[in-house]
Structure formats: structure tokens, C-alpha cells
Interface confidence: low
């Protein structure tokens, strides 16, 4: 049966022993059966979602794979320095200046770390069976609007670590089956909903470390109805407007960390009713509109750490009943009180600027930091008991 512990203490698994919050998830086996160090990983949100997705993906992939796999090359003659196995072409670091020409039945083409500067019109058109295209770490600066025409079977496109500054509306028009689009570390300075025209099946869009200063004040997901994960980490976005995410009904994860956001429209997240993880860490947010999180009924992970937030309303988190992890690191909460966190009945992890704040969330098993960096464990325990 479940052990009942006083507020601020948590059970040692099925032992009838309770330990204070401080001794749980501190890296030491204080219970004697390691129960206080079990289930300490904060594996909510993004990572859990990815795990779930990968599990499904590999299940599907394994059922579709060839009965008897062969290592023979089935894409005809291949360029020097390229490797080939079955219908997969590996031309990584092959000193290529352009997309190679091989048999049209190729299913995987990896062209990483070459010297491809432009993607010309119809450069991949004949590869109608291509499922995965890797173009990371080239010198691509120009992408023709018809570069990806004909790639009807493509499910994964990697364009990271290039020099792309602009993607024309319609460049992805034919990619109706694309599920992953990764454009990390490029020089994109703007996007519009029409940039993503045709991406009916897109699930994951990663635009980390580009030069975006603003998001369109138009429905960004208009042409990406199945989008689950959207990552804008490391851009220069200044504000979040009310229309941007209006069509992102299926969004599960939104990562906006390490931007320059200083303004949040009160309705910025209103339509994100399936959102599981929201990361706004390391921005310039000073004010949180009172109702900013009110529609995020499914949210399990929220990070607003390292923002110059002046004040957190007492009822700021009241609607987040499913929240499991809350990151408030680097935030001075001058008006902190237990009332702020009490409605968060499912909260298992909380992260503060100061150890002393943990006393205001006594029902949360894992609270960091779990020392003040000075006092001994005995002194800390004594002060908790006194309190």
C-alpha cells in the first residue's frame, strides 16, 4: 500500500519510511534501497515525446524492411569516394561540387561535408523514391524554388550547417510526405507560412541557430497541419504575436529558448491545446501576461528560466494541473509563496535560483538546487525541521 508522508517528505518506495525533499534526488542513497534516487530523471516533455515517436518509427520501419537484406549496390555506378549499399548512397566527404547522378531508384542519399554551393532547379527531380536526403555541412547559399521538385517519397531532409539565407515560398511544395525538416545553423532571416507550403505530413521542424528576428504575424502552421515539434532555439526573435501559432493545433513541443523575446502577447499560446513542452528559457521576458498559460491544459514541462522576470503572479500557474516539470532558474521571485505552486498537483521536478525557494514547494519531490552551496547537510536539515 502507499506510504503516507507529511508535507515536505516523500516515501522510500514501499518502505514505511519518509525522507525530506532535500534528501531525494541528491545523488546519495539515503533510503538504503535507492528508492530516493529512483525516478529522478526529468524525462517529461521533449525527450519523452521523441522516445515515443522513435519507438513507433522503428516499429514501422522494421515491419517494412527487406526480408533478406543485401549489401550489393543497386543504384548503378557511383562517384569516386562514395559508398553504396542496396539502394543507399553515402557520399559524405567525397569532394563533391554538385549533386551526383545515380540511378533513380536510390532511397537514401547522404552528401554531408562536401562543397555543394547551390541547389539548382530540378536537381533531385528524378529521385522519386528518395526517402532520406542529407545535405549537412556543405556551403549551400542558394536553393532554387524548384530544387526539391519531384521528391514525392522524401520523409527526412537535413539542411543543417549551411549558408542558406532565404527559402522561397513553395520550395518544399512537392514534399507531401516529409516528416522531418532540419535546418539548423544556417542564415535564415525570415520565414512565412508559405515557406512551408506543401508540407502536409511534417512532424518535426528544427530551425535552431538561424538569424530569425521575428516570426510572421500570420498562421505559421497553415500548411503544416500535423506539426508536433517546432524548435526555434538560438535565433534573435523579439516577440511572440497572437496569430503566429493560431493554426498549430497539434503542436506538442515548442522550443523558443535563447532568443531575444521581450514581449509575449497574452494570446500567443491560446491555440496550443495539445502542447506538452514549452521552453522560453534564456530570453528577455520581463512581464508574463496573467493568462499567458491558461489554455495549456496538457502542458507537462515549462521552462521560463533565465529571464529578467520582475514578478510572477500568485495564480500564474493555476491552470497547469498536468505540469510535471517547472524551471524557474535564475529568477528572483520576490513575492514567492506556497500558493503559487500548490495547484501544480502533478509537479515532480522544480528548479529555482535559490535553495531557499524549495521550502515553498514542499509537495514536489525533486527540487533543485538542493543545497545552498555553503551549509552542511545537517544544518540544512535542521533549518528545514525548524521551519
Amino acid at each position: 500500500q502507499d506510504v503516507s508522508c507529511p508535507l515536505g517528505s516523500f516515501p522510500c518506495g514501499n518502505m514505511s519510511r519518509c525522507l525530506p525533499q532535500l534528501l531525494h534526488c541528491n545523488g546519495v542513497d539515503d533510503c538504503g534501497n535507492r528508492a530516493d534516487e529512483d525516478h529522478c530523471g526529468d524525462n517529461n516533455g521533449w525527450s519523452l515525446q521523441l522516445d515515443k515517436y522513435f519507438a513507433n518509427y522503428y516499429k514501422l520501419a522494421s515491419t517494412n524492411s527487406f526480408e533478406a537484406e543485401t549489401s550489393e549496390c543497386l543504384v548503378g555506378s557511383v562517384p569516386m569516394h562514395c559508398l553504396c549499399r542496396d539502394l543507399e548512397l553515402d557520399c559524405d566527404e567525397a569532394n563533391l561540387r554538385a549533386v551526383p547522378s545515380v540511378s533513380s531508384n536510390v532511397t537514401v542519399m547522404s552528401l554531408q561535408r562536401n562543397f555543394i554551393r547551390t541547389l539548382p532547379p530540378n536537381g533531385f527531380r528524378k529521385y522519386h523514391e528518395l526517402q532520406k536526403l542529407c545535405l549537412q555541412n556543405n556551403r549551400i547559399h542558394s536553393v532554387s524554388v524548384s530544387a526539391f521538385r519531384g521528391l514525392r517519397s522524401l520523409t527526412k531532409l537535413y539542411l543543417s550547417h549551411n549558408r542558406i539565407t532565404f527559402l522561397k515560398p513553395g520550395v518544399f511544395e512537392d514534399l507531401h510526405r516529409l516528416e522531418w525538416l532540419i535546418i539548423e545553423d544556417n542564415h535564415l532571416s525570415r520565414i512565412s507560412p508559405l515557406t512551408f507550403y506543401g508540407l502536409n505530413s511534417l512532424i518535426l521542424l528544427v530551425l535552431m541557430n538561424n538569424a530569425l528576428t521575428r516570426l510572421p504575424d500570420k498562421p505559421l502552421c497553415q500548411h503544416m497541419p500535423r506539426l508536433h515539434w517546432l524548435d526555434f532555439e538560438g535565433n534573435r526573435i523579439h516577440n511572440l504575436r497572437n496569430l503566429t501559432f493560431i493554426s498549430c493545433n497539434n503542436l506538442t513541443v515548442l522550443v523558443m529558448r535563447k532568443n531575444k523575446i521581450n514581449y509575449l502577447n497574452e494570446h500567443a499560446f491560446t491555440h496550443l491545446q495539445k502542447l506538452d513542452e514549452l521552453d522560453l528559457g534564456s530570453n528577455k521576458i520581463e512581464n508574463l501576461p496573467p493568462n499567458i498559460f491558461k489554455d495549456l491544459k496538457e502542458l507537462s514541462q515549462l521552462n521560463i528560466s533565465y529571464n529578467p522576470i520582475q514578478k510572477i503572479e500568485v495564480n500564474q500557474f493555476d491552470c497547469l494541473a498536468k505540469l510535471k516539470s517547472l524551471s524557474l532558474e535564475g529568477i528572483e521571485i520576490s513575492n514567492i509563496q506556497q500558493r503559487m505552486f500548490r495547484p501544480l498537483i502533478n509537479l515532480s521536478h522544480i528548479y529555482f535560483k535559490k535553495f531557499q525557494y524549495c521550502g515553498y514547494a514542499p509537495h514536489v519531490r525533486s527540487c533543485k538546487p538542493n543545497t545552498d552551496g555553503i551549509s552542511s547537510l545537517e544544518n540544512l536539515l535542521a533549518s528545514i525541521i525548524q521551519r
Epitope: S144, V145, K168, E173, D174, R190, S192, Y197
Partner: antibody, heavy 118, light 112 residues
Framework: QVQLQQSGAELVRPGVSVKLSCKAS????????MNWVKQRPGQGLEWIGM????????VINQKFKDKATLTVDKSSSTAYMQLSSPTSEDSAVYYC???????????WGQGTTLTVSS | DVLMTQTPLSLPVSLGDQASISCRSS???????????LEWYLQKPGQSPNLLIY???NRFSGVPDRFSGSGSGTDFTLKISRVEAEDLGVYYC?????????FGSGTKLEIK
């Protein structure tokens, strides 16, 4: 608001190249294709070609491939069409038109009348 | 090239009447992405053309609901339910599915 302002009427001698301009305002020139359309007096409309200002990619109607050259100057948000060796057949009103990605011309210039005459 | 044939060339109507213009393409104008990029434009005397209908049946913003488009494959129709004086001019169909893009020859809507 979006506007396409075309250059004024031109009278040129046969064989002397002419360059028509279309200045875009109210939107970012580099985001949309710019098209050019010909209309001879009392006749219908004829599509010449289009250019994407972000990288100057052009798509030209083969009928005009030796006649029209499309260019852009991003710094002045202006698209140009140069007509080489004009003849009386080239006398017409020429329109520039913005092509929305839903494949329609949503904004048009007011037109430039070109008269080729000796 | 895709030939767009419009009928009639001239359409005399009385104000308040219904008008119907037909446009036939010489081959299917379904784009490889599944959309049919068939548009209707109206050019009033001395003016640039204006978009009325795109993708066969979608009214462009600000276009009155008396204008409607229909059709598929190679046969398309523009209907004006009650003609008003401001509707007079030349109507062009246009296909933007296959390069080179092509216009119909035009239908002149005039008062009877």
C-alpha cells in the same frame, strides 16, 4: 499597401533596346515571383516570363527567350525587363504583376506603353 | 503550350441578368501537386487586369459573391449571377499550372 509602379510610356526606334522598370513597395520584393505580361493594342494578354528576385532565377516563355531579359535590383526593390531589337510587333502595353504562391497575380502595375516606330 | 479557348468572344447582357463564360483548355491543367491553377481576371477599359477567381472556384478577397467559378480537368465556367454596370469589361481565363502560362483570348461583357 502593396504597389507596383511602372515606368512611363516609351517611344523607341526599331532595333534600339529598351528597358522597362517596375518598382515594388509595401512588401519585400524578394519574397514573390515578378511576372511580365504583354498586351498588344486591342488584343489579349500574353505571359512573357517571371523572375524570383531572391536569386534571380527566371522562367521564360520560349517565345520570348531571345526578346526579353528579366533582371532585378534588390537594393531599389525594382524589377526590369529589357527588350532587345524591338520591332513594331513589340509595340504593346507591358504589365508587371506579382505572383502569389497560390499561383495567381494578385497585384498588377499600371502598365507601360511601348511604341516602336521610326 | 496549353491553349485556352474562351467562348463567347462577346457577351451582350442586360443589367441584372445572369452571365456565363466558358473556358476550355487543350489539355488537363491539374498541376503535379493536385491543384488546378485556373484563374479569372477582369480588365476594365484603360485599366490593368484584376483577379476575380483563383484555383477554379475561390473568390479573391473583395470580390462580390455574385461571381462564382466552377469546372475541372479541361472545362471551366465563370458565372455572374446578376450583372451590374461595374462588371463590364473583358474577362480572361488563365492557367498557371504549366509553363508557359497562358491566357484565354478574352470575352467582352457589354450592355445589350
Amino acid at each position: 499597401q502593396v504597389q507596383l509602379q511602372q515606368s512611363g510610356a516609351e517611344l523607341v526606334r526599331p532595333g534600339v533596346s529598351v528597358k522597362l522598370s517596375c518598382k515594388a513597395s509595401g512588401y519585400s520584393l524578394t519574397t514573390y515571383w515578378m511576372n511580365w505580361v504583354k498586351q498588344r493594342p486591342g488584343q489579349g494578354l500574353e505571359w512573357i516570363g517571371m523572375i524570383h528576385p531572391s536569386d534571380s532565377e527566371t522562367v521564360i516563355n520560349q517565345k520570348f527567350k531571345d526578346k526579353a531579359t528579366l533582371t532585378v535590383d534588390k537594393s531599389s526593390s525594382t524589377a526590369y525587363m529589357q527588350l532587345s531589337s524591338p520591332t513594331s510587333e513589340d509595340s504593346a502595353v507591358y504589365y508587371c504583376a506579382r505572383w502569389d504562391y497560390d499561383y495567381y497575380f494578385d497585384y498588377w502595375g499600371q502598365g507601360t506603353t511601348l511604341t516602336v516606330s521610326s | 503550350d496549353v491553349l485556352m479557348t474562351q467562348t463567347p468572344l462577346s457577351l451582350p447582357v442586360s443589367l441584372g441578368d445572369q452571365a456565363s463564360i466558358s473556358c476550355r483548355s487543350s489539355q488537363s491543367i491539374v498541376h503535379s501537386n493536385g491543384n488546378t491553377y485556373l484563374e479569372w481576371y477582369l480588365q476594365k477599359p484603360g485599366q490593368s487586369p484584376n483577379l476575380l477567381i483563383y484555383k477554379v472556384s475561390n473568390r479573391f478577397s473583395g470580390v462580390p459573391d455574385r461571381f462564382s467559378g466552377s469546372g475541372s480537368g479541361t472545362d471551366f465556367t465563370l458565372k455572374i449571377s446578376r450583372v451590374e454596370a461595374e462588371d463590364l469589361g473583358v474577362y480572361y481565363c488563365f492557367q498557371g499550372s504549366h509553363v508557359p502560362f497562358t491566357f484565354g483570348s478574352g470575352t467582352k461583357l457589354e450592355i445589350k
